[in-house]
């Protein structure tokens, strides 16, 4: 903590500008008015302050706002955001998507830090649910964001938000997460026609039950093997050879390459050899 010292004559800062980079830490503490800093936060980013100087500026804001910064200040924190601790951020009330975007921009290109995770958590809890605009923003900055949420947290995603989800946003989701997301996606895309529906629902199918896979098999969807391999084993096992053949269409010959991988292996073992032989792939049940 910086010791309290009087500001030398003529050094009082009338505004936040480049001249402050030549101030020692104690001079910044003594000569920069915290209220002035708060109103001119947008200027701080344009000035090449050292990390030590930024520490002083943060300290001044902390003193001015012991209960947490107002959103007008938070929105213009810029690189000063990197100095904040999760404890600092828990005091904030961030409601504007623009504020969220501004702070995520500061951390862009980096892994999600504890600060960012706390910020997002505060923002989403404040909104009460993961609406489409928020999800759009978060997945744009962090494609893996959705899959970092627990199934419980995902349950607060409204079906309307599913339209913002891109296939790559689901890359790291596990089956438990897809179990929660799939019914929402099914609801969101229910009014689409067959082929368009399959394109949209494909990434969520790791959460699909057997009856939905049976229904898809009647729609000439030609599911690829990568998608088939991501299906729940318990959902695949009851499918007949004829249903799998219809589901995969021309991709059915790909079963041969994956005959020892789950869920293909487990499915093969459940089938009658006579039925498997109709595929002409040499699969051994």
């Amino acid at each position: 903590e910086v010791e309290k010292t009087a500001c030398p004559s003529g050094k009082k800062a009338p505004e936040i500008d480049e001249s402050l980079i030549f101030y020692k830490k104690w001079e910044l503490e003594a000569c920069v008015d915290a209220a002035l800093l708060a109103t001119q936060m947008d200027r701080v980013n344009a000035i090449p302050f050292t990390y030590e100087q930024l520490d002083v500026l943060k300290h001044k804001l902390d003193e001015l706002y012991p209960q947490g910064y107002p959103e007008s200040v938070i929105q213009h924190l810029g690189y000063l955001f990197l100095k904040m601790s999760p404890e600092d951020i828990r005091k904030w009330n961030v409601t504007s998507l623009e504020t969220l975007k501004a702070l995520l921009e500061v951390n862009k290109g980096h892994e999600m830090s504890p600060q960012v995770a706390t910020l997002i958590d505060r923002f989403v809890k404040g909104r009460g649910q993961l609406d489409k605009d928020t999800l759009d923003t978060l997945t744009a900055f962090y494609p893996g964001y959705l899959c970092s949420l627990s199934p419980e947290e995902l349950s607060s995603v409204p079906p309307s938000s599913i339209w913002a989800v891109r296939p790559q946003d689901l890359d790291t989701c596990d089956p438990r997460q897809l179990d929660v997301l799939y019914p929402k996606a099914r609801l969101a895309f229910q009014n689409m026609n067959g082929s368009e529906y399959f394109v949209k629902i494909q990434s969520f199918l790791g959460g699909a039950p057997t009856e939905d896979l049976k229904a898809l098999s009647q729609q000439n969807v030609s599911m690829d093997l990568a998608t088939f391999m991501k299906l729940r084993t318990d959902a695949v096992l009851p499918l007949t050879v004829a249903e799998v053949q219809k589901l995969l269409g021309p991709h059915v010959e790909g079963l041969k390459a994956e005959e020892r991988h789950r869920p293909v292996r487990d499915w093969i073992l459940r089938q009658r050899q006579d039925d498997l032989d109709t595929l002409g792939l040499g699969l051994q049940g």
Partner: antibody, heavy 119, light 108 residues
């Protein structure tokens, strides 16, 4: 551009283990299988096994079963091959290779990692 | 395991010459499950031909592949200097997947 980047050469002692990373870029790692292939000096290629990155399910050539372990970190898009109980016979170049799920051919190969087992 | 035998092990060809490399399987392989790879010294292998006769992306049209059952071949209609490399056949019809011993093709 699709790339599989492997680490540099490894010199290891007999009996030790080696873990080789294969960093995938330019595509979604969970949409393809990742296979591993051994090439001893001046010799042919030998299939070690493969892993489906989405669920981590791996299968092995019986010759390497119990000594090789194939894993994937989906978050960093990196596949790994660990080989234990190394002997001079394991001195070779090891390649990771992408395989389109549902096919058996390798359309993209890693840069290769040379492993030398010597005391 | 299914054994693939390539012949000849080493061969050289003059520019413009027609070249045929063969791959013989110890038991029948469906044509879908047979591919060829090219490898130059110090480099990784490259997919060259898949499903017996399909050329991989960027492979010159002078290359072709054919065969069925236990007998497969890769043909270069007119040898060029850049074709000098080792060629390996590969099957994924049965586990473990196996490769042939390779043919080293040199330019005269």
């Amino acid at each position: 551009e699709v790339q599989l980047q492997q680490s540099g050469p490894e010199l290891v002692k007999p009996g030790a283990s080696v873990k080789i990373p294969c960093k995938a870029s330019g595509y979604t790692i969970t949409d393809y299988n990742m296979d591993w292939v051994k090439q001893s000096r001046g010799k042919s290629l030998e299939w070690i096994g493969d892993v489906f990155p989405y669920n981590g399910d791996s299968i092995y050539n019986q010759k390497f079963e119990g000594r090789a372990t194939l894993t994937v970190d989906k978050y960093s898009s990196t596949a790994y091959m660990e080989l234990r109980g190394l002997t001079s016979e394991d001195t070779a170049v090891y390649f990771c290779a992408r395989r389109k799920t549902g096919t058996g051919y390798f359309d993209v190969w890693g840069t290769g990692t040379t492993v030398t087992v010597s005391s | 395991q299914l054994v693939l035998t390539q012949s000849p092990a080493i061969m050289s060809a003059s520019p413009g010459e027609k070249v045929t490399l063969t791959c013989s399987a110890s038991s029948s392989v469906s044509s879908t499950y047979l591919s060829w790879y090219l490898q130059k010294p110090g480099s990784s292998p490259k997919l060259w031909i898949y499903s017996t006769s399909n050329l991989a992306s960027g492979v010159p049209a002078r290359f072709s592949g054919s065969g069925s059952g236990t007998s497969y071949s890769l043909t270069i209609s007119s040898m060029e200097a850049e074709d000098a490399a080792s060629y390996f056949c590969h099957q994924w019809s049965s586990y473990p997947y196996t490769f042939g011993g390779g043919t080293k093709l040199e330019i005269k």
